[in-house]
């Protein structure tokens, strides 16, 4: 591999690594609630309206705001540039994704709506272990705007274990967001959409390269956390957000100082939701093990605004609302590492439905 990018240095941003988190739950003050984008088939397991949960709606003080899922005016081509075998796609043309990649029409897709009362408490889901995520300023890392998101490419050495014998290495992280007045997380909780979401993508150590793992059960694992507004600035995220202006143009790439990647995630790695799904962008490969943390990460309003207005995508349009509609569960069970269901008994339920990567 060629060495070093010249003339692409980023300025270091000092600050502590506290990410500032909050628990999901009825005390969360949401910015907005969305109706479900794609209801599950009426097979008795997933009612079509998550906002029909009156108890949840009342306790959160939510209104049933049915909002557009991914506006057709959002950035990017709509899959119409087929010359030369192009596979361009956009968040405004998600119905065309199966034409770009047939896997996008698969039965076990991501993201999903996490309905707390339908999660299965699984005692075997242990706290995640992260090793080597506290990076030093050198070597520097590549931060890029690929027209769909902001991506931080991670170096070798960041190791994560979902459980015994289920080891992964981090490849990259990226974010999903909305606009200043519309939240943009990919996963939702009881129909509630959060302002933004971080994904840290990992490759199973059972595979040496990404292409081998795509579509294989447990080949990839993604750690996801919701970003939420709070009064304080998040110093860890500022080390990313402070550089967005430098990569405002699609295709831009810079080098920024290494940072503590674990500080971008919640501090409580023991309480999370787990299910098997897919990549949320084409090629939508399935077999991806998703871990969605219960704690949210707190960013200031200014930081969330910076995230939503700093980047540009194709055709001189703002890079915003870069989230996919939630997908049907189609019989999947979402496991929880803690009793997440409001009416759950102290004893674990559906213990036999717990799975391990690669099952």
């Amino acid at each position: 591999q060629p060495q070093g990018l010249s003339g692409m240095q980023g300025e270091p941003s000092l600050g502590d690594s506290s990410s500032g988190e909050d628990e999901l739950g009825v005390d969360v003050l949401p910015s907005e609630e969305d109706a479900p984008e794609e209801a599950d088939p009426p097979d008795g397991e997933d009612p079509p309206e998550v906002n029909s949960e009156d108890r949840m709606e009342e306790s959160l003080g939510l209104e049933d705001l049915s909002t557009p899922e991914a506006p057709e005016h959002s950035q990017g081509s709509h899959g119409d540039e087929k010359g030369g075998g192009h596979s361009h796609w956009s968040y405004g043309g998600t119905l065309l994704w199966p034409q770009v990649s047939p896997a996008c029409a698969g039965r076990f897709q991501s993201p999903v709506d996490i309905r707390l009362e339908r999660t299965a408490f699984c005692r075997t889901l242990q706290p995640l272990e992260l090793l080597g995520y506290e990076l030093q300023p050198l070597p520097e890392l590549s931060l890029s705007n690929n027209g769909h998101t902001v991506q931080l490419t991670l170096p070798p050495g960041l190791k994560m274990a979902l459980g015994p014998g289920q080891e992964y290495r981090a490849l990259q992280l990226h974010l999903h967001w909305g606009t200043s007045d519309h939240p943009g997380s990919e996963h939702t909780v009881n129909g509630h959409r959060f302002p933004a979401e971080i994904h840290v993508v990992h490759l199973s150590t059972a595979f040496s390269e990404l292409h081998e793992a795509l579509g294989r059960p447990g080949g990839l694992a993604v750690l996801a956390a919701f970003l939420q507004e709070s009064p304080e600035e998040n110093s860890a995220y500022e080390q990313l957000l402070s550089h967005l202006e430098e990569i405002s143009e699609e295709g831009s790439k810079i080098e920024i100082p290494g940072l503590d990647v674990s500080a971008l995630l919640p501090s409580d790695l023991s309480r999370y939701y787990r299910y098997e799904g897919s990549l949320t962008t084409p090629p939508c490969s399935q077999g991806v093990i998703w871990t969605v943390f219960n704690e949210t990460v707190k960013l200031s309003a200014k930081q969330l605004h910076t995230l939503s207005v700093s980047l540009w995508g194709p055709r001189d349009s703002r890079l915003q609302l870069n989230f996919r509609a939630t997908q049907p569960l189609n019989g999947r069970t979402i496991e929880a590492s803690f009793p997440a269901a409001e009416d759950s008994s102290p004893e674990p339920v559906h213990v036999n439905s717990c799975f391990t990567a690669g099952d």
Partner: nanobody
Framework: QVQLVESGGGLVQPGGSLRLSCSAS???????????VAWYRQAPGKGLELVSV???????KYSDSVKGRFTISRDNSKNTLYLQMNSLRAEDTAVYYC????????WGQGTLVTVSS
């Protein structure tokens, strides 16, 4: 194993043209189509410089030094990336590398372009 093989380099006079190709072989078809693909170059004794990129969203970007002279294109049906280089100058002399970025970075071994009279 994904392999990126560059070709098309060589010796050319100032003002001349070359067309570089980068073919992705191996089991990579399901990656190339969805990746951001780019050309980088490294001049003797210099650092790595981004020449041009086509993002996964379809946008293109060029470094100021090649804008208006170089054209990047891709053919996903052939898993191939191209760089058409016109009006070549001595300062374009470098090893040119192909890069495929989809969750993971893939690099070619490089092809040498020498612009000299």
């Amino acid at each position: 194993q994904v392999q990126l093989v560059e070709s098309g380099g060589g010796l050319v006079q100032p003002g001349g043209s070359l067309r570089l190709s980068c073919s992705a072989s191996g089991n990579s078809a399901n990656i190339f189509s969805f990746a951001s693909v780019a050309w980088y170059r490294q001049a003797p004794g210099k650092g790595l410089e981004l020449v041009s990129v086509i993002t996964s969203a379809g946008g293109t970007k060029y470094s100021d030094s090649v804008k208006g002279r170089f054209t990047i294109s891709r053919d996903n049906s052939k898993n191939t990336l191209y760089l058409q280089m016109n009006s070549l100058r001595a300062e374009d002399t470098a090893v040119y590398y192909c890069n495929v970025d989809y969750l993971q970075d893939y690099w070619g071994q490089g092809t040498l372009v020498t612009v000299s009279s």
